[in-house]
């Protein structure tokens, strides 16, 4: 599923991201947009052998299990695939992992480099929420 | 267990396409990738791509784009890859397997024979 | 694309014997590295997965080491049934590539 710019900042509010270890929902919907344009089913591999999965694009050497990633932490408990449904609530609950895990949202590369101390409230601008 | 079929040998003419199809059972199929490996007498395996099931994501070896094409069914927990353009370079025995890094799972493979 | 060279192409042995099969690749792939057994008109076999775990059901006459660059499947005491084509695989990167093969032969 490709969600709508309002259409996933609707629903990142009801599964409670808004504000969530400090960090509106601005952020989390400009981090949706760079890492995968919103769209669910978005996956990429690095070099590293692990493969990103999702909206959020969760990664498989720590967060999720693919089934292939050399030493694979799991973190979060989930196979990969489940990061790909069209409900986003198991990207969701696994990113609040990754965002309490020290680094805050500098662990999405794409937040850092395009959405770090930029108008991030641009992106829930208009929305009914 | 896990087990992968796939579909029995094939002869097609040249120019023609053929679709080969892997069914998988005894694991949750939309959780891993299914990879394709093609495999010639003196050519050794060659990875063709893969595609996992639970979202249609595909990846192609560059060699075999616009030869390949994969899908799966995920009601029927079925792969497949279709080839078009059929050449004699083609003839091959085509393996599907699962994708775990290593391949443990491996289906019995798809002979195909290109002739005129 | 990671180049696997294998050595060598054949190698003729009696029962009995012990053998060193190499896989070498054309950039440092740490340890992912599988190697796989074939025979005739069947699929490839897991032997070894990540250079050196042995797969379960696997004799252990069979293993494996190495890391980087270079890689090696010994077999401790032929068998007969050790016959046929062994192949060696990388996982670091895509696109994955396989090595040409060392046929093992009854000498």
């Known amino acids: 599923k490709v969600f709508g710019r309002c259409e996933l900042a609707a629903a990142m509010k009801r599964h409670g991201l808004d504000n969530y270890r400090g960090y509106s929902l601005g952020n989390w919907v400009c981090a949706a947009k760079f890492e995968s344009n919103f769209n669910t089913q978005a996956t990429n591999r690095n070099t590293d052998g692990s493969t990103d999965y999702g909206i959020l694009q969760i990664n498989s050497r720590w967060w999720c299990n693919d089934g292939r990633t050399p030493g694979s932490r799991n973190l979060c408990n989930i196979p990969c695939s489940a990061l790909l449904s069209s409900d986003i609530t198991a990207s969701v609950n696994c990113a609040k992992k990754i965002v309490s895990d020290g680094n805050g949202m500098n662990a999405w590369v794409a937040w850092r480099n395009r959405c770090k101390g930029t108008d991030v409230q641009a992106w829930i601008r208009g929305c009914r929420l | 267990q896990v087990q992968l079929q796939e579909s029995g040998a094939e002869v097609m003419k040249p120019g023609a396409s053929v679709k080969i199809s892997c069914k998988a059972t005894?694991?949750?199929?939309?959780?891993?990738?299914i990879e394709w490996v093609k495999q010639r007498p003196g050519h050794g395996l060659e990875w063709i791509g893969e595609?996992?099931?639970?979202?249609?994501?595909?990846y192609y070896n560059e060699k075999f784009k616009g030869k390949a094409t994969f899908t799966a069914d995920t009601s029927s927990n079925t792969a497949y890859m279709q080839l078009s353009s059929l050449t004699s370079e083609d003839s091959a025995v085509y393996y599907c397997?699962?994708?775990?890094?290593?391949?443990?799972?491996w289906g019995q493979g798809t002979t195909l024979t290109v002739s005129s | 694309d990671i180049e696997l060279t294998q050595s060598p192409a054949t190698l003729s042995v009696t029962p009995g014997d012990s053998v060193s099969l190499s896989c070498r690749a054309s950039?440092?792939?740490?340890?992912?590295l599988h190697w796989y057994q074939q025979k005739s008109h069947e699929s490839p076999r897991l032997l070894i997965k990540?250079?050196?775990q042995r797969d379960s059901g696997i004799p252990s006459r069979f293993s494996g080491s190495g890391s980087g660059t270079d890689f090696t499947l010994s077999i401790n005491s032929v068998e007969t049934e050790d016959f046929g084509m062994y192949f060696c695989?990388?996982?670091?990167?895509?696109?994955?590539?396989f090595g040409g093969g060392t046929k093992l032969e009854i000498k």
């Open positions: 397997a699962r994708g775990d890094g290593f391949y443990y799972y």
């Open positions: 005894g694991y949750t199929f939309t959780t891993y990738w």
């Open positions: 595609i996992l099931p639970g979202s249609g994501s595909t």
């Open positions: 950039q440092s792939i740490s340890n992912n």
């Open positions: 990540y250079a050196s």
């Open positions: 695989q990388q996982s670091n990167s895509w696109p994955r590539t």
